[in-house]
Protein backbone atom coordinates (compact mmCIF):
# COMPACT_ATOMS: atom_id res chain seq x y z
CA UNK A 1 0.00 0.00 0.00
CA UNK A 2 1.52 3.31 -0.86
CA UNK A 3 1.97 5.41 1.92
CA UNK A 4 -0.08 9.08 2.37
CA UNK A 5 2.00 11.64 1.07
CA UNK A 6 1.23 15.70 1.88
CA UNK A 7 0.44 17.06 -0.94
CA UNK A 8 1.62 21.08 -0.99
CA UNK A 9 1.16 23.55 -3.48
CA UNK A 10 4.37 24.71 -4.37
CA UNK A 11 6.50 22.82 -6.82
CA UNK A 12 8.58 20.31 -5.57
CA UNK A 13 12.17 19.73 -4.87
CA UNK A 14 14.45 20.57 -8.01
CA UNK A 15 15.95 17.27 -9.47
CA UNK A 16 18.86 16.03 -8.54
CA UNK A 17 18.83 18.42 -5.48
CA UNK A 18 21.90 16.92 -3.59
CA UNK A 19 24.33 17.04 -6.40
CA UNK A 20 23.77 20.18 -7.50
CA UNK A 21 24.41 21.54 -4.32
CA UNK A 22 27.50 19.48 -4.11
CA UNK A 23 28.42 20.31 -7.08
CA UNK A 24 28.15 24.57 -6.97
CA UNK A 25 29.73 24.15 -3.52
CA UNK A 26 33.46 22.64 -5.23
CA UNK A 27 32.55 25.30 -8.10
CA UNK A 28 31.97 28.37 -5.85
CA UNK A 29 35.20 26.75 -3.85
CA UNK A 30 37.45 26.93 -7.23
CA UNK A 31 36.26 30.06 -8.27
CA UNK A 32 37.00 31.54 -4.70
CA UNK A 33 40.46 30.76 -3.38
CA UNK A 34 39.62 32.16 -0.04
CA UNK A 35 37.13 29.93 1.01
CA UNK A 36 39.31 26.60 -0.42
CA UNK A 37 39.21 25.49 3.51
CA UNK A 38 35.22 24.51 3.05
CA UNK A 39 34.37 21.21 2.81
CA UNK A 40 31.53 20.23 0.24
CA UNK A 41 30.44 17.30 1.97
CA UNK A 42 30.16 18.85 5.22
CA UNK A 43 28.22 21.54 3.78
CA UNK A 44 25.87 19.20 2.16
CA UNK A 45 25.33 17.48 5.23
CA UNK A 46 24.59 20.43 7.08
CA UNK A 47 22.16 21.23 4.61
CA UNK A 48 20.17 18.49 4.53
CA UNK A 49 20.00 18.36 8.66
CA UNK A 50 18.12 21.09 8.44
CA UNK A 51 15.14 20.07 6.24
CA UNK A 52 15.68 15.90 6.64
CA UNK A 53 13.09 14.73 8.68
CA UNK A 54 11.58 17.98 9.92
CA UNK A 55 8.03 18.81 8.98
CA UNK A 56 8.51 21.63 6.06
CA UNK A 57 6.16 24.36 8.01
CA UNK A 58 8.19 24.25 11.15
CA UNK A 59 11.77 24.77 10.06
CA UNK A 60 13.29 27.27 12.34
CA UNK A 61 16.46 29.68 11.38
CA UNK A 62 18.19 27.73 14.04
CA UNK A 63 17.51 24.53 11.89
CA UNK A 64 20.10 26.12 10.14
CA UNK A 65 22.85 27.53 12.00
CA UNK A 66 25.17 24.41 11.32
CA UNK A 67 25.33 25.50 7.24
CA UNK A 68 25.34 29.14 8.33
CA UNK A 69 28.66 28.26 10.47
CA UNK A 70 30.64 25.79 8.02
CA UNK A 71 29.45 28.92 5.08
CA UNK A 72 30.87 32.10 7.17
CA UNK A 73 32.35 33.84 4.47
CA UNK A 74 33.74 37.73 5.54
CA UNK A 75 32.61 40.17 2.08
CA UNK A 76 33.51 43.74 2.15
CA UNK A 77 31.05 45.52 3.97
CA UNK A 78 31.07 48.25 2.13
CA UNK A 79 31.05 46.24 -1.33
CA UNK A 80 27.39 44.88 -0.70
CA UNK A 81 24.42 44.76 -3.90
CA UNK A 82 20.56 44.51 -2.35
CA UNK A 83 18.44 44.02 -4.96
CA UNK A 84 14.55 43.37 -5.07
CA UNK A 85 12.53 41.74 -7.98
CA UNK A 86 15.30 42.35 -10.52
CA UNK A 87 18.08 39.92 -9.85
CA UNK A 88 19.56 39.24 -13.42
CA UNK A 89 20.24 42.62 -14.06
CA UNK A 90 21.98 42.91 -10.28
CA UNK A 91 23.76 40.00 -10.81
CA UNK A 92 25.23 40.80 -14.15
CA UNK A 93 26.63 44.07 -12.44
CA UNK A 94 28.43 42.39 -10.04
CA UNK A 95 29.72 39.88 -12.97
CA UNK A 96 31.42 43.26 -14.38
CA UNK A 97 31.66 45.29 -10.99
CA UNK A 98 33.64 42.32 -9.09
CA UNK A 99 34.64 44.10 -6.06
CA UNK A 100 30.79 44.48 -5.65
CA UNK A 101 28.48 41.49 -4.01
CA UNK A 102 25.10 40.37 -4.14
CA UNK A 103 23.82 37.68 -1.28
CA UNK A 104 23.98 35.36 -4.58
CA UNK A 105 27.82 36.09 -4.77
CA UNK A 106 28.31 34.39 -1.61
CA UNK A 107 28.90 30.58 -1.37
CA UNK A 108 25.28 30.09 0.82
CA UNK A 109 23.40 32.88 -1.75
CA UNK A 110 25.23 30.65 -4.57
CA UNK A 111 24.24 26.82 -3.83
CA UNK A 112 20.84 27.52 -3.20
CA UNK A 113 20.07 30.47 -5.94
CA UNK A 114 16.86 29.53 -8.28
CA UNK A 115 16.50 25.95 -5.99
CA UNK A 116 13.97 24.63 -4.22
CA UNK A 117 13.69 21.85 -1.39
CA UNK A 118 11.79 20.04 1.22
CA UNK A 119 11.45 16.87 3.35
CA UNK A 120 8.68 15.18 5.18
CA UNK A 121 7.99 14.49 8.79
CA UNK A 122 10.05 11.36 10.25
CA UNK A 123 11.45 10.18 6.87
CA UNK A 124 14.74 10.35 5.51
CA UNK A 125 13.16 11.12 2.10
CA UNK A 126 13.88 14.55 0.20
CA UNK A 127 9.94 15.48 -1.58
CA UNK A 128 10.09 15.65 -5.34
CA UNK A 129 6.99 15.81 -5.83
CA UNK A 130 5.55 19.02 -4.06
CA UNK A 131 7.05 21.61 -1.74
CA UNK A 132 5.16 23.87 0.42
CA UNK A 133 4.10 28.39 -0.82
CA UNK A 134 4.59 30.72 0.94
CA UNK A 135 1.33 32.27 0.95
CA UNK A 136 -1.20 29.07 0.41
CA UNK A 137 0.69 26.85 2.53
CA UNK A 138 3.01 28.25 5.17
CA UNK A 139 5.95 30.91 5.82
CA UNK A 140 8.18 28.67 7.96
CA UNK A 141 8.86 26.40 5.09
CA UNK A 142 12.53 25.41 4.26
CA UNK A 143 13.61 27.46 1.06
CA UNK A 144 11.65 30.97 2.30
CA UNK A 145 13.53 30.43 6.39
CA UNK A 146 16.23 29.60 4.51
CA UNK A 147 16.79 33.04 2.49
CA UNK A 148 15.39 34.57 5.60
CA UNK A 149 18.41 33.69 7.62
CA UNK A 150 21.11 34.31 4.79
CA UNK A 151 19.41 37.41 4.31
CA UNK A 152 19.35 38.99 7.42
CA UNK A 153 23.05 38.36 8.28
CA UNK A 154 23.93 39.25 4.71
CA UNK A 155 22.19 42.83 5.71
CA UNK A 156 23.78 42.98 9.17
CA UNK A 157 27.25 42.59 7.99
CA UNK A 158 26.45 45.88 5.74
CA UNK A 159 28.41 48.98 6.34
CA UNK A 160 29.25 52.53 4.81
CA UNK A 161 27.25 53.07 1.67
CA UNK A 162 24.69 50.36 0.91
CA UNK A 163 23.30 50.07 -2.19
CA UNK A 164 19.92 48.84 -3.86
CA UNK A 165 18.90 48.12 -6.97
CA UNK A 166 15.13 48.18 -7.30
CA UNK A 167 12.51 47.51 -10.15
CA UNK A 168 11.04 50.35 -11.46
CA UNK A 169 8.34 48.84 -13.79
CA UNK A 170 6.24 47.09 -10.71
CA UNK A 171 3.75 48.47 -9.46
CA UNK A 172 5.20 48.33 -5.78
CA UNK A 173 8.85 49.93 -6.50
CA UNK A 174 9.53 49.25 -2.71
CA UNK A 175 7.64 46.27 -2.03
CA UNK A 176 7.22 45.70 2.47
CA UNK A 177 6.36 42.32 1.66
CA UNK A 178 9.40 40.83 -0.35
CA UNK A 179 13.30 40.01 1.07
CA UNK A 180 14.34 43.06 0.75
CA UNK A 181 11.67 45.33 2.47
CA UNK A 182 10.79 42.78 5.20
CA UNK A 183 14.20 41.20 6.28
CA UNK A 184 16.96 43.18 4.88
CA UNK A 185 15.57 46.93 5.46
CA UNK A 186 15.65 46.38 9.19
CA UNK A 187 18.67 44.82 9.31
CA UNK A 188 20.63 46.93 8.13
CA UNK A 189 22.66 48.15 11.48
CA UNK A 190 22.77 52.07 12.15
CA UNK A 191 25.99 52.03 13.62
CA UNK A 192 27.47 50.54 10.75
CA UNK A 193 25.60 52.23 7.56
CA UNK A 194 25.61 55.59 6.88
CA UNK A 195 23.55 55.71 3.61
CA UNK A 196 21.01 53.22 1.69
CA UNK A 197 21.47 54.30 -1.51
CA UNK A 198 18.33 53.27 -4.16
CA UNK A 199 18.97 52.67 -8.13
CA UNK A 200 15.32 52.52 -9.45
CA UNK A 201 15.80 50.97 -12.75
CA UNK A 202 13.62 52.04 -15.44
CA UNK A 203 11.71 49.56 -18.22
CA UNK A 204 10.74 51.40 -20.63
CA UNK A 205 13.05 53.22 -23.08
CA UNK A 206 11.30 56.52 -23.18
CA UNK A 207 10.26 56.60 -19.66
CA UNK A 208 11.83 59.90 -18.31
CA UNK A 209 9.59 60.19 -15.30
CA UNK A 210 11.57 60.45 -11.60
CA UNK A 211 10.99 57.15 -10.09
CA UNK A 212 12.38 58.57 -6.92
CA UNK A 213 9.54 60.41 -6.32
CA UNK A 214 7.17 57.14 -6.23
CA UNK A 215 5.13 56.55 -2.76
CA UNK A 216 6.45 53.80 -2.60
CA UNK A 217 10.74 54.76 -2.69
CA UNK A 218 8.96 57.75 -0.63
CA UNK A 219 8.05 55.02 2.23
CA UNK A 220 11.31 53.18 2.08
CA UNK A 221 12.74 56.90 2.91
CA UNK A 222 10.56 57.41 5.71
CA UNK A 223 11.10 53.78 7.11
CA UNK A 224 15.23 54.24 6.13
CA UNK A 225 15.29 57.73 7.82
CA UNK A 226 13.51 56.17 11.06
CA UNK A 227 16.28 54.33 11.95
CA UNK A 228 18.81 56.83 11.40
CA UNK A 229 20.37 55.93 8.42
CA UNK A 230 20.36 58.06 5.76
CA UNK A 231 18.54 57.62 2.04
CA UNK A 232 19.84 58.69 -1.49
CA UNK A 233 17.50 57.46 -4.90
CA UNK A 234 18.86 57.66 -8.35
CA UNK A 235 16.83 57.02 -11.58
CA UNK A 236 18.43 54.31 -13.89
CA UNK A 237 16.76 55.11 -16.94
CA UNK A 238 18.83 52.87 -19.20
CA UNK A 239 20.06 49.70 -17.33
CA UNK A 240 21.80 48.58 -20.90
CA UNK A 241 23.76 51.65 -21.37
CA UNK A 242 24.59 51.56 -17.83
CA UNK A 243 25.96 47.96 -17.48
CA UNK A 244 28.02 49.00 -20.49
CA UNK A 245 29.45 52.14 -19.07
CA UNK A 246 30.13 49.85 -15.64
CA UNK A 247 32.03 47.99 -18.30
CA UNK A 248 33.89 50.86 -20.29
CA UNK A 249 33.76 53.84 -18.05
CA UNK A 250 36.16 55.57 -20.57
CA UNK A 251 33.84 55.83 -22.56
CA UNK A 252 32.39 59.11 -23.93
CA UNK A 253 28.96 58.85 -23.89
CA UNK A 254 29.30 57.41 -20.06
CA UNK A 255 29.00 60.89 -18.71
CA UNK A 256 25.63 61.74 -19.60
CA UNK A 257 22.60 60.68 -17.28
CA UNK A 258 22.38 56.93 -17.63
CA UNK B 1 60.19 34.51 6.27
CA UNK B 2 61.76 31.79 9.01
CA UNK B 3 60.83 28.19 10.59
CA UNK B 4 62.36 27.46 13.76
CA UNK B 5 62.07 24.53 15.96
CA UNK B 6 63.40 21.43 14.09
CA UNK B 7 65.61 18.96 16.02
CA UNK B 8 65.54 15.15 16.65
CA UNK B 9 62.70 13.75 18.50
CA UNK B 10 62.01 10.31 19.44
CA UNK B 11 58.83 8.62 17.68
CA UNK B 12 55.49 9.49 19.13
CA UNK B 13 56.96 12.69 20.98
CA UNK B 14 54.68 15.69 19.62
CA UNK B 15 57.22 18.83 17.80
CA UNK B 16 56.09 22.70 17.28
CA UNK B 17 57.84 24.27 14.34
CA UNK B 18 57.34 28.27 14.60
CA UNK B 19 57.56 30.38 11.29
CA UNK B 20 58.46 33.68 11.92
CA UNK B 21 57.48 36.72 9.30
CA UNK B 22 58.38 40.36 9.21
CA UNK B 23 57.72 43.12 6.53
CA UNK B 24 54.22 42.28 5.72
CA UNK B 25 50.85 40.69 8.29
CA UNK B 26 49.34 37.44 8.29
CA UNK B 27 46.16 39.09 8.38
CA UNK B 28 46.53 39.96 4.93
CA UNK B 29 47.59 36.41 3.79
CA UNK B 30 47.83 32.76 3.62
CA UNK B 31 50.68 30.79 4.78
CA UNK B 32 51.75 27.37 3.86
CA UNK B 33 54.04 24.23 4.92
CA UNK B 34 55.74 22.48 2.97
CA UNK B 35 58.17 19.35 3.62
CA UNK B 36 61.08 17.52 2.10
CA UNK B 37 62.23 14.40 2.87
CA UNK B 38 66.17 13.90 2.43
CA UNK B 39 66.42 13.21 -1.20
CA UNK B 40 63.22 13.21 -2.28
CA UNK B 41 60.54 15.80 -4.06
CA UNK B 42 57.88 18.74 -2.59
CA UNK B 43 54.88 17.60 -0.68
CA UNK B 44 52.50 20.57 0.52
CA UNK B 45 51.26 19.80 4.09
CA UNK B 46 48.46 22.53 4.32
CA UNK B 47 47.40 26.08 4.54
CA UNK B 48 46.32 28.52 7.14
CA UNK B 49 44.10 31.99 5.58
CA UNK B 50 44.80 35.18 6.68
CA UNK B 51 40.92 34.12 8.61
CA UNK B 52 42.49 31.55 10.37
CA UNK B 53 40.94 29.04 8.42
CA UNK B 54 42.71 25.50 7.71
CA UNK B 55 43.06 23.47 4.90
CA UNK B 56 45.19 20.28 4.41
CA UNK B 57 46.45 17.42 2.49
CA UNK B 58 44.22 14.37 2.97
CA UNK B 59 46.98 12.77 3.88
CA UNK B 60 48.39 15.85 6.62
CA UNK B 61 44.86 15.71 8.46
CA UNK B 62 45.22 14.54 12.27
CA UNK B 63 48.78 14.29 12.05
CA UNK B 64 49.84 18.16 11.78
CA UNK B 65 48.02 21.45 13.15
CA UNK B 66 48.99 24.69 11.74
CA UNK B 67 47.61 27.58 14.03
CA UNK B 68 48.76 31.34 14.44
CA UNK B 69 49.98 32.20 17.63
CA UNK B 70 50.53 35.92 16.90
CA UNK B 71 50.42 38.38 14.21
CA UNK B 72 53.98 37.65 13.35
CA UNK B 73 54.40 33.54 14.14
CA UNK B 74 52.50 30.61 12.79
CA UNK B 75 52.89 27.34 14.40
CA UNK B 76 53.12 23.66 12.95
CA UNK B 77 52.28 20.57 15.11
CA UNK B 78 53.91 17.73 13.83
CA UNK B 79 51.18 15.32 16.39
CA UNK B 80 52.87 12.38 16.65
CA UNK B 81 55.94 11.90 14.81
CA UNK B 82 57.19 8.89 13.04
CA UNK B 83 60.26 7.73 10.94
CA UNK B 84 58.67 9.04 7.84
CA UNK B 85 58.26 12.71 9.29
CA UNK B 86 61.46 12.78 8.70
CA UNK B 87 61.97 16.02 6.29
CA UNK B 88 63.38 19.67 6.08
CA UNK B 89 60.13 21.28 6.47
CA UNK B 90 59.40 24.76 5.08
CA UNK B 91 56.81 27.71 5.47
CA UNK B 92 56.08 30.15 2.61
CA UNK B 93 53.58 32.97 2.09
CA UNK B 94 50.78 32.94 -0.71
CA UNK B 95 51.67 34.76 -3.43
CA UNK B 96 48.77 37.06 -3.41
CA UNK B 97 46.38 38.49 -1.15
CA UNK B 98 43.38 35.53 -0.80
CA UNK B 99 45.33 34.75 -3.49
CA UNK B 100 45.76 30.89 -5.24
CA UNK B 101 47.63 28.27 -3.78
CA UNK B 102 50.98 29.61 -5.42
CA UNK B 103 54.22 29.77 -2.46
CA UNK B 104 56.65 32.92 -2.76
CA UNK B 105 58.90 33.83 0.16
CA UNK B 106 59.92 30.53 1.54
CA UNK B 107 62.10 30.80 4.67
CA UNK B 108 65.60 28.24 4.52
CA UNK B 109 63.42 25.33 5.71
CA UNK B 110 64.09 23.75 9.58
CA UNK B 111 65.37 20.07 9.89
CA UNK B 112 63.12 17.14 11.91
CA UNK B 113 64.83 14.11 12.41
CA UNK B 114 62.82 11.08 13.80
CA UNK B 115 64.62 8.28 15.04
CA UNK B 116 64.73 6.13 18.32
CA UNK C 1 49.88 7.67 -6.86
CA UNK C 2 51.39 11.20 -8.04
CA UNK C 3 48.39 13.37 -8.75
CA UNK C 4 50.73 15.46 -11.15
CA UNK C 5 53.47 13.44 -12.91
CA UNK C 6 56.72 14.98 -14.53
CA UNK C 7 58.51 13.81 -17.09
CA UNK C 8 61.45 13.46 -17.91
CA UNK C 9 62.93 13.03 -14.67
CA UNK C 10 65.86 14.35 -15.47
CA UNK C 11 67.54 15.92 -18.87
CA UNK C 12 70.77 17.10 -19.91
CA UNK C 13 70.87 20.20 -21.92
CA UNK C 14 73.94 22.34 -23.69
CA UNK C 15 74.13 26.60 -22.52
CA UNK C 16 71.77 28.30 -25.34
CA UNK C 17 69.79 25.02 -25.89
CA UNK C 18 66.31 24.35 -25.24
CA UNK C 19 64.71 22.43 -22.26
CA UNK C 20 61.02 21.10 -22.02
CA UNK C 21 59.00 19.89 -18.89
CA UNK C 22 55.87 17.67 -19.19
CA UNK C 23 53.45 18.05 -15.97
CA UNK C 24 50.26 16.22 -16.58
CA UNK C 25 47.30 15.95 -13.89
CA UNK C 26 45.47 12.71 -13.60
CA UNK C 27 42.56 15.15 -12.86
CA UNK C 28 42.06 18.49 -13.92
CA UNK C 29 43.36 21.39 -12.64
CA UNK C 30 41.36 24.16 -10.87
CA UNK C 31 40.15 26.87 -13.15
CA UNK C 32 42.02 25.01 -16.03
CA UNK C 33 44.97 27.01 -15.16
CA UNK C 34 45.86 27.08 -11.40
CA UNK C 35 49.65 25.89 -12.17
CA UNK C 36 53.06 27.28 -10.93
CA UNK C 37 56.11 26.11 -11.88
CA UNK C 38 59.04 26.50 -9.01
CA UNK C 39 62.98 25.80 -9.38
CA UNK C 40 65.14 24.38 -6.28
CA UNK C 41 68.80 24.39 -6.03
CA UNK C 42 70.56 21.72 -3.40
CA UNK C 43 70.27 23.18 0.03
CA UNK C 44 67.44 26.36 -0.98
CA UNK C 45 64.58 26.43 -0.50
CA UNK C 46 62.37 26.63 -4.29
CA UNK C 47 61.94 29.52 -5.99
CA UNK C 48 58.50 30.62 -7.87
CA UNK C 49 59.27 31.06 -11.61
CA UNK C 50 55.72 30.89 -12.75
CA UNK C 51 52.06 30.99 -11.84
CA UNK C 52 48.74 30.37 -13.99
CA UNK C 53 50.40 28.19 -15.95
CA UNK C 54 51.85 31.08 -17.65
CA UNK C 55 52.27 34.14 -15.71
CA UNK C 56 56.04 35.13 -15.20
CA UNK C 57 56.82 35.48 -11.18
CA UNK C 58 58.20 39.32 -10.73
CA UNK C 59 61.77 39.18 -11.31
CA UNK C 60 62.06 35.61 -13.37
CA UNK C 61 64.02 36.07 -16.65
CA UNK C 62 61.71 35.88 -19.84
CA UNK C 63 63.76 32.49 -21.12
CA UNK C 64 61.45 31.05 -18.73
CA UNK C 65 58.15 30.43 -19.97
CA UNK C 66 54.40 28.26 -19.54
CA UNK C 67 51.92 26.84 -20.90
CA UNK C 68 48.96 24.46 -21.20
CA UNK C 69 46.02 24.15 -19.16
CA UNK C 70 43.50 21.84 -18.24
CA UNK C 71 45.70 18.32 -17.24
CA UNK C 72 49.03 18.92 -19.52
CA UNK C 73 51.27 21.67 -18.61
CA UNK C 74 54.91 22.12 -20.23
CA UNK C 75 57.97 24.76 -18.78
CA UNK C 76 60.05 25.94 -21.30
CA UNK C 77 63.68 27.22 -20.91
CA UNK C 78 65.20 28.77 -24.17
CA UNK C 79 68.54 29.81 -24.35
CA UNK C 80 69.41 27.68 -21.27
CA UNK C 81 72.34 29.05 -19.01
CA UNK C 82 74.60 27.17 -15.90
CA UNK C 83 73.17 28.56 -13.51
CA UNK C 84 69.68 26.89 -14.66
CA UNK C 85 71.09 23.92 -13.19
CA UNK C 86 68.24 22.57 -10.60
CA UNK C 87 65.29 20.71 -9.87
CA UNK C 88 62.26 22.11 -11.47
CA UNK C 89 58.73 21.28 -9.85
CA UNK C 90 55.36 21.73 -10.98
CA UNK C 91 52.48 22.30 -8.37
CA UNK C 92 48.62 22.57 -9.22
CA UNK C 93 45.77 23.00 -7.29
CA UNK C 94 43.44 19.50 -7.20
CA UNK C 95 39.92 18.38 -5.96
CA UNK C 96 39.63 14.96 -4.13
CA UNK C 97 37.16 15.40 -1.80
CA UNK C 98 38.60 18.79 -1.30
CA UNK C 99 40.89 21.15 -2.87
CA UNK C 100 44.75 21.11 -2.34
CA UNK C 101 48.34 21.98 -3.32
CA UNK C 102 49.98 18.98 -4.88
CA UNK C 103 53.52 18.57 -6.35
CA UNK C 104 55.24 16.59 -9.88
CA UNK C 105 58.14 14.33 -8.73
CA UNK C 106 60.39 16.97 -9.78
CA UNK C 107 62.81 16.85 -12.72
CA UNK C 108 66.54 17.55 -12.44
CA UNK C 109 67.97 19.93 -15.16
CA UNK C 110 71.86 18.94 -16.07
CA UNK C 111 73.71 22.03 -17.70
CA UNK C 112 76.41 20.88 -19.54
Known amino acids: VPRWRQQWSGPGTTKRFPETVLARCVKYTEIHPEMRHVDCQSVWDAFKGAFISKHPCNITEEDYQPLMKLGTQTVPCNKILLWSRIKDLAHQFTQVQRDMFTLEDTLLGYLADDLTWCGEFNTSKINYQSCPDWRKDCSNNPVSVFWKTVSRRFAEAACDVVHVMLNGSRSKIFDKNSTFGSVEVHNLQPEKVQTLEAWVIHGGREDSRDLCQDPTIKELESIISKRNIQFSCKNIYRPDKFLQCVKNPEDSSCTSEI | VEESGGRLVTPGTPLTLTCTVS????????MTWVRQAPGRGLEWIGV??????TNYARWAKGRFTISKTSSTTVDLKITSPTTEDTATYFC??????????????WGPGTLVTVSS | AQVLTQTPSSVSAAVGGTVTINCQSS????????LAWYQQKPGQPPKLLIY???TLAPGVPSRFSGSGSGTQFTLTISGVQSDDAATYYC????????????FGGGTEVVVK
Open chain 3, 27 to 34: QSIANSDE
Open chain 2, 23 to 30: GFSLSNYD
Open chain 3, 91 to 102: QGTVYDSGWYAA
Open chain 2, 92 to 105: ARILYNKGRYYFTF
Open chain 3, 52 to 54: DAS
Open chain 2, 48 to 53: ISSGDN
